[in-house]
């Protein structure tokens, strides 16, 4: 919907989770609402309780199975409804046909670690979490490094246009504390978006050797 005050937006993590946010101006705060998922070609259906995340915004996670199980494919369509209780009955507030592989948002990368650090460079690796095997190598990454005295928003973005789960940061300052984050996005999907940023990894470059130019 063009109108930004009322939206029902969901993303699939490519394995067994659909996360939804329902925003609605003027909605009753104390009303009980839920998201109902009905796949077009599966025997299961799933429900989650919408919980407030702000004044006019609610969110919930549809857990479809074990975290690494492949519960949906590229041909699946899941009808998602927001239902709110009105007295003794449930009223449909919003509806959409959800195409999971057109609406992807992966989990944030995990297990960030420093592989090797020097005075001016640092090699960092990470892993992707709960990502479908369907992607094969069709993933891209963005990374950013927080330098002293700067904010994350000011950090330049480094783009890795392939499935590369490591990076060598260069032109760093010796004996300096940095933080590093990375996020991932599949190439597939018209409405696919970036994963959340990973937890920051803190590291420190080695001091310059005494008596040597740096």
């Amino acid at each position: 919907a063009v109108n930004g005050t009322s939206q029902f937006t969901c993303f699939y993590n490519s394995r067994a989770n659909i996360s939804c946010v329902w925003s609605q101006d003027g909605a009753l705060q104390d009303t009980s609402c839920q998201v109902h998922a009905w796949p077009d070609r599966r025997r299961w259906n799933q429900t989650c309780e919408l919980l407030p995340v702000s004044q006019a915004s609610w969110a919930c996670n549809l857990i479809l199975g074990a975290p690494d199980s492949q519960k949906l494919t590229t041909v699946d369509i899941v009808t998602l409804r927001v239902l709110c209780r009105e007295g003794v009955r449930w009223r449909v507030m919003a509806i959409q046909d959800f195409k999971p592989f057109e609406n992807l948002r992966l989990m944030a990368p995990i297990s960030l670690q420093v592989v090797h650090v020097e005075t001016h460079r640092c090699n960092i690796s990470w892993e992707i979490s709960q990502a479908s095997h369907y992607f094969e190598r069709h993933l891209e990454f963005e990374a950013r490094t927080l330098s002293p005295g700067h904010t994350w928003e000011e950090a330049p973005l480094l783009t890795l246009k392939q499935k590369q789960e490591w990076i060598c940061l260069e032109t760093l300052t010796p004996d300096t504390q940095y933080e590093f984050q990375v996020r991932v996005k599949p190439l597939q999907g018209e409405f696919t978006t970036w994963s959340p940023w990973s937890q920051p990894l803190a590291f420190r470059t080695k001091p310059a050797a005494l008596g040597k130019d740096t």
Epitope: A1, Q7, T9, T79, A94, I95, D97
Partner: nanobody
């Protein structure tokens, strides 16, 4: 952009039936929610029914449940509203509307609207 053109309205008697059509065109029609709304003289526009394009899942207003049926023909990019057991209070201008991604969180909020077709039920 989505363009919507309604047709099929007219003057009918109480208890009669009618079929309204909405021809949709535009790039995002294939993933839209399509709805019918109506506005009676001197009243606010009200939700009647909605259908999802891909699976044909439907939602109806209580006032028309069991009497009106919304359907779609994907090949013709057309949405229909079959009105039966018509009552004088069904007299209104009927509007076709479309909701495209990101989808509305409110069945009353749509992105694109047709110009409407008049339905008059006389007793």
């Amino acid at each position: 952009q989505v363009q919507l053109v309604e047709s099929g309205g007219g003057l009918v008697q109480v208890g009669d039936s009618l079929r309204l059509s909405c021809a949709a065109s535009g790039r995002t029609v294939g993933s839209a929610n399509m709805g019918w709304f109506r506005q009676a003289p001197g009243k606010e526009r009200e939700f009647v029914a909605v259908i999802t394009w891909s699976t044909g899942s439907t939602v109806y207003a209580d006032s028309v449940k069991g009497r009106f049926t919304i359907s779609r023909d994907n090949a013709k990019n057309t949405v229909y509203l079959d009105l039966s057991s018509l009552k004088p209070e069904d007299t209104a201008v009927y509007y076709c509307a479309a909701d495209v991604y990101p989808y509305s969180g409110n069945l009353n909020i749509m992105d694109y609207w047709g110009k409407g077709t008049q339905v008059t039920v006389s007793s």
